[in-house]
């Protein structure tokens, strides 16, 4: 069965910036990355960036920066000022769809133990 | 405009083979997941093939799997399904559908069907 | 397997009232569920994709609502042209479903 993991960081240089690193675990070839805050995508939660293989990667502030690292795993960046910057506890989600297996998600946040840079 | 054009139904007898074509125009082929969908007389809609856009990934329901191969010509901005070891239960309007991926792979075009008929 | 169950079965509406079809998933489907229209001898037509969202060119009139396994088609106010069979469908995991279809009609 195919899984999804989720590491969220925060930066040391900026203390309210996040990086979150998703990853797939499975067969399938990946069609769609959906990246959200406050819950998975489809209960409540609000996108932060969705990443297509092959057409481009759309994001929404307070992302800063969305790409891929390999065929299976993204990373994003989170900008830390401003009123719609995330917290420590916030959570964040990642949906990976796979055709024609389907979707997988997985959520994480910053552990609450955890000092800047370091990783989930 | 996006266009599906289906071909290729009949009536073949209990065990015979039948191969449907799919004719598309209008949107780049090559990037889409396509299906075969199919929906008896009087009865719902089952998705009997799927194949990802770079033709590696396929999928098949228990019904038809091991008789029905759903294959892809992007040169020729083609699908197809061939269809061995027909059966009565077989006989429906066999839809060819395309798939979006940004809209949690719905079905967003369909042709117009072309009608299989199982029959002795 | 996901099963789609869709209630009613069929339904009859005045012009002008609201129509509501709903469709329960045997398990969570997240939001990836969508709305086909399908009218006779015609193919099937998407109308709601992410439980939620219009395609191109469906009227406001038609939306939809719901989470994890409850979902629901709205008709805001019923025109004779929707009359129709309804289907939700389900692609967030392999075998994709659909429901049985809810067929429409005008009282």
């Known amino acids: 069965t195919p899984e999804v993991w989720v590491q969220v960081r925060m930066e040391a240089t900026e203390l309210s910036s996040f990086t979150i690193r998703c990853g797939f675990l499975g067969s399938g070839s990946i069609s769609l990355v959906t990246v959200s805050w406050g819950g998975p995508n489809g209960a409540g939660g609000t996108t932060l960036a969705v990443l297509h293989p092959e057409r481009g990667i759309r994001q929404w502030a307070p992302a800063r920066q969305a790409r891929w690292e390999t065929q299976s795993s993204i990373s994003l960046i989170l900008e830390g000022s401003g009123a719609s910057s995330p917290c420590a506890n916030t959570t964040f989600c990642c949906k990976f769809a796979s055709f024609p297996e389907g979707s997988w998600e997985a959520c994480g946040s910053l552990p609450p133990s955890s000092d800047p840079g370091l990783s989930a | 405009e996006v266009q599906l054009v289906e071909s290729g139904g009949g009536l073949v007898q209990p065990g015979g083979s039948l191969r449907l074509s799919c004719a598309a125009s209008?949107?780049?082929?090559?990037?889409?997941?396509m299906s075969w969908v199919r929906q008896a007389p009087g009865k719902g809609l089952e998705l009997v093939a799927a194949i990802s856009r770079d033709g590696d990934s396929t999928y098949y329901p228990d019904t038809v799997k091991g008789r029905f191969t759903i294959s892809r010509d992007d040169a020729e901005n083609s699908l197809y399904l061939q269809m061995n070891s027909l059966r009565a239960e077989d006989t429906a309007v066999y839809y060819c559908?395309?798939?979006?991926?940004?809209?949690?792979?719905?079905?967003?075009?369909w042709g117009q069907g072309t009608l299989v008929t199982v029959s002795s | 397997d996901i099963v789609m169950t869709q209630s009613p079965d069929s339904l009859a509406v005045s012009l002008g009232e609201r129509a509501t079809i709903n469709c329960k998933a045997s398990q969570s489907v997240s939001n990836d569920v969508a709305w086909y229209q399908q009218k006779p001898g015609q193919p099937p037509k998407l109308l709601i994709y992410?439980?939620?969202h219009r395609f191109t060119g469906v009227p406001d009139r038609f939306s939809g609502s719901g989470s994890g396994t409850d979902f629901t088609l709205t008709i805001s106010s019923l025109q004779a042209e929707d009359v129709a069979v309804y289907f939700c469908h389900q692609a967030y995991r392999s075998p994709w479903t659909f429901g049985q279809g809810t067929k429409l009609e005008i009282k």
């Open positions: 992410y439980v939620s």
């Open positions: 559908s395309r798939h979006e991926d940004y809209f949690g792979f719905a079905m967003d075009s």
């Open positions: 209008g949107f780049t082929f090559s990037s889409y997941h």
